[in-house]
């Protein structure tokens, strides 16, 4: 399928978004401007925008200003300056600031907790299925199958550490070779990037915010997919990861270390364990083909158990089956031997909500999935709101400058590498790349961090999660130490290789450009974000899985033509943009294809028809519900009261001329009042964060 023409203008000047440019970005137009810009991408940029009825002056935008929708928005301060406040005002403002900080930390805490619960919910819903994916014998011979199993399992359990630990236990039990495990680890790396993409979907309400958040989240996806695209064939051909890691493991005489420090879990566990506790061993047991485990529940019931080891007499078919000749005898009727058995006695039940409900795993998982997504969404909305009120004026300027500015020349190139280290360090602290990248996503959305800066932070996060795995491997018991360490190192070197591929040279930073392209499409057609999520994390892996089960011939028979078409389209796209004269007139653009193959417009019409029923029942009262609604239907008329969808009626009517949005006014509160959103009396109570 050919690319859509929308992509053509998505980024007129890709070189503009290099690391170096981050520091000195021009002042951005306001959110609404950007919104209108995306509403009609084909419209010439220089068009004079129509003014709102309440405006008294004709404001003409400089074309340079509107040019780049990726510039960070100016979060203007509507509050009274600190120096102009009286003592009472200062005290009030101080306590407001403290209150906001406490609220921010509180919501951040529940945000992280909801991510943990979300992972548990996914494990309850799909954990057993995930375990069964691993028991497929074809993994050994088919690296592509291993890759998609890694993706699917990690998506299903929402935790790369869970899927990696299953792989480790399978390798140490000789059910899997390190060679077969490497593609699974690569897949787990891809699967883990779904979490922050889901988090980005929560910011769907505001087009420009969503554009940035979704691009910021998917930069992780594209980095992982592109790394696999290059490194999996390299690994299959050379086995470089296996060889390097084997040399490292063999050259060091490792002693069992201590457990990797649980830093964030120390704070979140007391809360999350009151909600639900899981017996993670069940998934591993299913992966190891343990038939008994298939009937076990993942919900942990007994937290305190007493394990007693005893020897019992058991019958064996013949003396050849005895544990040892000395421990073998017959009673003249049957042959007997001694067997060590572990008798587990339940002492105390766990203290969580679901302990006495005895509900099936699917029911518990579904309940937790819905609740955790609601809490996640609610917390995210509140975090964005609080950050929006805190990060204004001087504070915003300082933070933005600190985060997004490069080191002075000639050390500018070092900034990104420092960001990688910061990302790795932060991930090591929170012990989860999902948590770190998910926390980063709303910050990208509201415009505190540029995608150019978020990219190295995300790459660092990938490294950070592998260092955690290395520490965990060093704490493994003797028999699992070698395999777990080698797999952790494979994960580490895979990410290092990916960084070397897609970071040092600005030209190779394809994930940024691809993420921005996807951000533009998703901002215009918001349903495409969900479509992308389903396609890349479910349909493609499931298709490859199905084809792999059918055998190599089927996989190659279907795969080769598909890959050939993709390469052909990419080459044609490259020639169209770089040197179109080389191509025949017909191939210089995509107009020779039917509209549905080159544009999302017809698809959008189909989706709009399909979601028409939702538009009618669009809810204004509930913000969370509204955001979900806006994601499904690009409804222009609904949710105006909650400012969830910023489309104006003109956009629906297909007008070419963008409407000047009220946010263009210097004082944001005036524009809000004009819309009837904020009572005039409240405008002066705004307090700039300290």
């Amino acid at each position: 399928m050919a690319p859509w023409p929308e992509l053509g203008d998505a980024q007129p000047n890709p070189d503009k978004y290099l690391e170096g440019a981050a520091g000195q970005q021009p002042t951005a137009p306001d959110k609404s401007k950007e919104t209108n810009k995306t509403d009609n991408t084909e419209a010439p940029v220089t068009k004079i925008e129509l003014l709102p009825s309440y405006s008294t002056a004709t404001l003409i935008d400089e074309p340079t200003e509107v040019d780049d929708p990726w510039n960070l928005p100016t979060l203007q301060d509507s509050g009274i300056k600190w120096s102009e406040r009286d003592t009472k005002g200062k005290i009030l403002c101080f306590f407001q600031g403290i209150g906001r900080l406490i609220l921010l930390l509180g919501f951040l805490y529940f945000f992280v907790c909801s991510l943990d619960i979300l992972s548990s919910a996914f494990q309850l819903v799909g954990g057993k299925m995930a375990g069964q994916f691993f028991s497929n014998s074809s993994i050994m011979s088919n690296p592509l199958l291993g890759l998609v199993i890694g993706v699917l399992v990690t998506v299903l359990v929402q935790s790369s550490s869970t899927s990696t630990s299953i792989v480790v236990s399978m390798v140490s039990s000789s059910l899997l070779t390190v060679r077969a495990a490497i593609p699974i680890i690569m897949g787990a790396n891809i699967g883990t990037s779904i979490t922050n993409t889901i988090v980005a979907l929560m910011q769907v309400g505001d087009r420009s915010e969503f554009r940035r958040a979704f691009a910021g989240a998917t930069v992780h996806d594209f980095f992982n997919w592109l790394s696999v695209l290059v490194l999996l064939p390299v690994e299959v051909a050379t086995h470089y990861l296996e060889i390097i890691t084997q040399l490292i493991v063999e050259s060091f005489h490792f002693k069992n270390g201590e457990d990797a420090p649980d830093l964030l879990k120390v704070i979140t566990k007391p809360f999350t364990k009151l909600i639900v506790q899981l017996d993670k061993k069940v998934i591993s047991q299913i992966a190891m083909n343990d038939e008994k485990a298939k009937n076990k529940s993942l919900v942990k019931i007994w937290c305190k158990t007493f394990t007693n080891k005893t020897q019992i007499n058991v019958t064996v078919p013949s003396t050849a089956n005895c544990t040892s000749p000395s421990l073998c005898w017959t009673d003249g009727i049957q042959n007997w031997t001694m067997k060590n058995v572990t008798y587990k006695e339940n002492i105390a039940k766990c203290q969580h909500i679901f302990v006495n409900f005895h509900l099936p795993d699917l029911a518990v998982g579904t309940i937790l999935l819905i609740l955790s997504l609601l809490v996640l969404c609610g917390c995210l909305i509140m975090i964005v709101k609080i950050l929006g009120s805190v990060l204004k004026g001087q504070v915003a300027t300082v933070i933005k400058k600190t985060i997004n500015t490069d080191f002075p020349f000639p050390f500018a190139w070092l900034t990104g590498y420092l960001a990688i280290l910061v990302g790795a360090g932060m991930t090591f602290i929170v012990q989860s790349s999902s948590v770190f990248t998910s926390a980063l996503t709303p910050l990208i959305g509201i415009g505190v961090i540029t995608i150019e800066r978020a990219y190295p932070l995300t790459l660092g996060s990938n490294i950070g999660t592998t260092t955690t795995a290395i520490l965990a491997a060093l704490a493994s018991p003797g028999n699992a130490l070698r395999s777990s360490l080698q797999i952790a190192l494979c994960h580490f070197f895979f990410n290092i290789s990916g960084i070397l591929l897609w970071y040092p040279i600005p030209f190779t930073r394809l994930p940024i450009r691809m993420a921005k392209g996807l951000g533009n499409i998703s901002a215009k057609y918001r349903w495409f974000a969900v479509f992308y999520l389903i396609i890349f994390f479910f349909l493609i892996p499931l298709t490859v899985f199905g084809l792999s089960l059918a055998g190599w011939r089927v996989l190659v028979g279907v795969g080769v033509p598909v890959v050939f078409i993709i390469i052909l389209v990419l080459c044609l796209r490259l020639l169209q943009s770089r040197c179109p004269r080389v191509l025949p007139k017909k191939l210089q653009n995509w107009n020779f294809l039917p509209l549905w193959m080159r544009s999302l417009k017809p698809w959008d019409a189909v989706v709009s028809k399909f979601t028409g029923c939702f538009q009618m029942r669009c809810c204004c009262c509930c913000r969370v519900c509204c955001r979900a609604c806006c994601l499904l239907c690009d409804c222009p008329k609904c949710c105006r009261c909650s400012k969830c969808c910023e489309d104006l009626e003109e956009a629906q009517e297909g007008q070419d001329v963008p409407v000047k949005a009220p946010e263009t006014f210097d004082n944001i509160t005036i524009s809000r009042e004009a819309q009837g959103e904020v009572p005039a009396s409240d405008s002066k109570t705004e307090c700039t964060a300290l």
């Epitope: 019958t315 005898w329 017959t330 009673d331 003249g332 009727i333 049957q334």
Partner: antibody
Framework: QVHQQQSGPELVKPGASVRISCKAS????????IHWVKQRPGQGLEWIGC????????KYNEKFKDKATLTADTSSTTAYMHLSSLTSEDSAVYFC?????????????WGAGTTVSVSS | DVLMTQTPLSLPVSLGDQASISCRSS???????????LEWYLQKPGQSPRLLIY???NRFSGVPDRFSGSGSGTDFTLKITGVEAEDLGVYYC?????????FGGGTKLEIK
Amino acid sequence: QVHQQQSGPELVKPGASVRISCKASGYTFTSYYIHWVKQRPGQGLEWIGCIYPGNLFTKYNEKFKDKATLTADTSSTTAYMHLSSLTSEDSAVYFCARFLNWNAWYFDVWGAGTTVSVSS
Amino acid sequence: DVLMTQTPLSLPVSLGDQASISCRSSQSIEHSNGNTNLEWYLQKPGQSPRLLIYKVSNRFSGVPDRFSGSGSGTDFTLKITGVEAEDLGVYYCFQGSHFPWTFGGGTKLEIK
């Protein structure tokens, strides 16, 4: 006290079947074999077979394979012998005996016997 | 099947006398594990059998020491020194080494 309580005497018609029981008490039922022995009036003893309640393993004398079926119910600590297609040849006293199978093998505890009379 | 032949069929004794019962097997009754599983049982009229000797020569608990067993391979003997009135009944030898397990025909110990 270790004891094997057998069911009362049975009078059955030829061709019919009968189930006699042997209730064990005073020991761990699942740790010992229960053997069944036949004694026709004025004659010697014949070993029929045995069952191990721990795993319900059974061993039969080929001569009685089609005649006797041994079962055990661990919850009621009772062993059963089902005799089918009875003829006058099956009229006898049937004993159940506990068999000690560790170190030495022997029948250390016997039931009082169940008299089965086959008569038309 | 291993045939166990007991002699004599009937043994009349006076109280206080020594009695000797012989049991011969049609083949060696030594088990593959080295044990010779030969037992002697006494059945009094109207009662169930009672164990006297196991593994050829081992007296079962509660059995008086006037009972002794001996033999090896295929020939085995039960000796009672100083017969008492309570010793009267039918004595059976039993082999539990080869399936099917078999009893001897029995020897009736009676007063002269």
